[in-house]
């Protein structure tokens, strides 16, 4: 029987910069029941606080609700593991909420086949940013990525769309049914999950473009 091994806070995420959650990985348990507590202070403070919510984020987590979350201050946190034989502490972790945002997927993905008379046909898609993200403030830039594949294909084809919320793809296989998805990330954050798949049937008379190009 031993004191617990050193825990590690390995992940922090915020869906919208208004709340966030951090998760830790326990070290070895030393063969005894182990209690974990997360303590933190914010930059400019010396007063230590205990995690306000150990439940919402699931096991080995700490959730900071709206009233505990500030974008203006760096959080300095640490996890303490204690059993009957002693204690161990994680390394201190510094968290700036700006840099842990993982948004919800983009919304309202619509996909259409466009067949203008004077030009080659193309696949046109548009979407909306996730509702929880406030893009009006200016500091929050979302980047988008699209993936698509014929229904029965194994490999996805991905396209980076930058900050645009619409996109054209010129090269597609006629007669195929395609799955299309989109995801987003802030410049210094994390990719969202992929949006639910949207299906589109490519007409049999769709003319393949000579070059496998996509256009913004």
């Amino acid at each position: 029987q031993l004191p617990p091994g050193k825990p590690e806070i390995f992940k922090c995420r915020s869906p919208n910069k208004e709340t966030f959650t951090c998760w830790w990985r326990p070290g070895t348990d030393g063969g005894l029941p182990t209690n974990y507590s997360l303590t933190y202070h914010r930059e400019g403070e010396t007063l230590m606080h205990e995690c306000p919510d150990y439940i919402t984020g699931g096991p080995n987590s700490c959730h900071f609700g709206k009233q505990y979350t500030s974008m203006w201050r760096t959080y300095v946190m640490m996890v303490n593991a204690t059993n009957q034989m002693g204690s161990s502490f994680s390394d201190e972790l510094y968290v700036d909420v700006t840099y842990i945002v993982q948004p919800d997927p983009p919304l309202e993905l619509t996909v259409e086949v466009k067949q203008p008379e004077d030009r080659k046909p193309y696949l046109w898609m548009k979407w909306s940013p996730p509702t929880l993200i406030d893009l009006k403030t200016g500091w929050f830039t979302l980047l988008y990525e699209i993936r698509l594949k014929p229904e029965k294909a194994a490999e996805w084809e991905t396209h980076f769309a930058g900050q645009q919320t619409e996109f054209k793809i010129l090269s597609l296989h006629p007669g195929q049914k395609y799955l299309v998805q989109v995801r987003c990330k802030p410049d210094h954050g994390y990719w969202s999950a992929w949006s639910p798949a949207t299906f589109i049937q490519i007409p049999s008379d769709f003319i393949m473009n000579d070059h496998h190009h996509h256009h913004h």
């Epitope: 930059e43 203006w72 840099y99 500091w139 994390y190």
Partner: antibody, heavy 118, light 112 residues
Framework: EVQLVQSGAEVKKPGSSVKVSCKAS????????IHWVRQAPGQGLEWIGE????????NYNQKFKGRATLTVDKSSSTAYMELSSLRSEDTAVYYC???????????WGQGTLVTVSS | DVVMTQTPLSLSVTPGQPASISCRSS???????????LHWYLQKPGQSPQLLIY???NRFSGVPDRFSGSGSGTDFTLKISRVEAEDVGVYFC?????????FGGGTKVEIK
Amino acid sequence: EVQLVQSGAEVKKPGSSVKVSCKASGYTFTSYWIHWVRQAPGQGLEWIGEIDPSDSYTNYNQKFKGRATLTVDKSSSTAYMELSSLRSEDTAVYYCARSFFTNWFAYWGQGTLVTVSS
Amino acid sequence: DVVMTQTPLSLSVTPGQPASISCRSSQSLVHSNGNTYLHWYLQKPGQSPQLLIYKVSNRFSGVPDRFSGSGSGTDFTLKISRVEAEDVGVYFCSQSTHVPFTFGGGTKVEIK
């Protein structure tokens, strides 16, 4: 203990490429961005770019875009910085550095001296 | 790119005496999220840089309280209240508000 251990010194010819490695240990490699910074002899520090090891997303200093390539190997917890079309002005100590969930550099590698000389 | 200008270039200080280093940026370092990402690093002789102060005035873990940072907008200062022999090296200010991140030219601190 967090450690960033870099590869050894290199001497390269002008026009060639160099690939510097940075092996991370003591933490979950995919959690934090890795930055690359260089320091020419007797000079200041110059930021080359950054990479998120979780998805290999990169941001580059425009000055190095097209010449510097940042990559990671998650299986060995190693980050790499490759610089091509080397010239004498690229002679410098190249550092990898790690952030937290922040945008400043908390841990630094020991540095790798790259000398470009004909 | 944001140009960071440090003064003085070098500083020779008697142990126990204070020291002050100035850093000026060519544009405001207030991020659109309201934070100011101005940091100070020390590079001791033969070593890699180490973080001293983050976000203008916050001491990093293990940094002695004789180091303090202040300033806002474009003008920033690092102060050492009582210089010790172990404080010798080159001090760099750095901004990470704007990409590319940039550094000042450095201030070399020596002991008299």
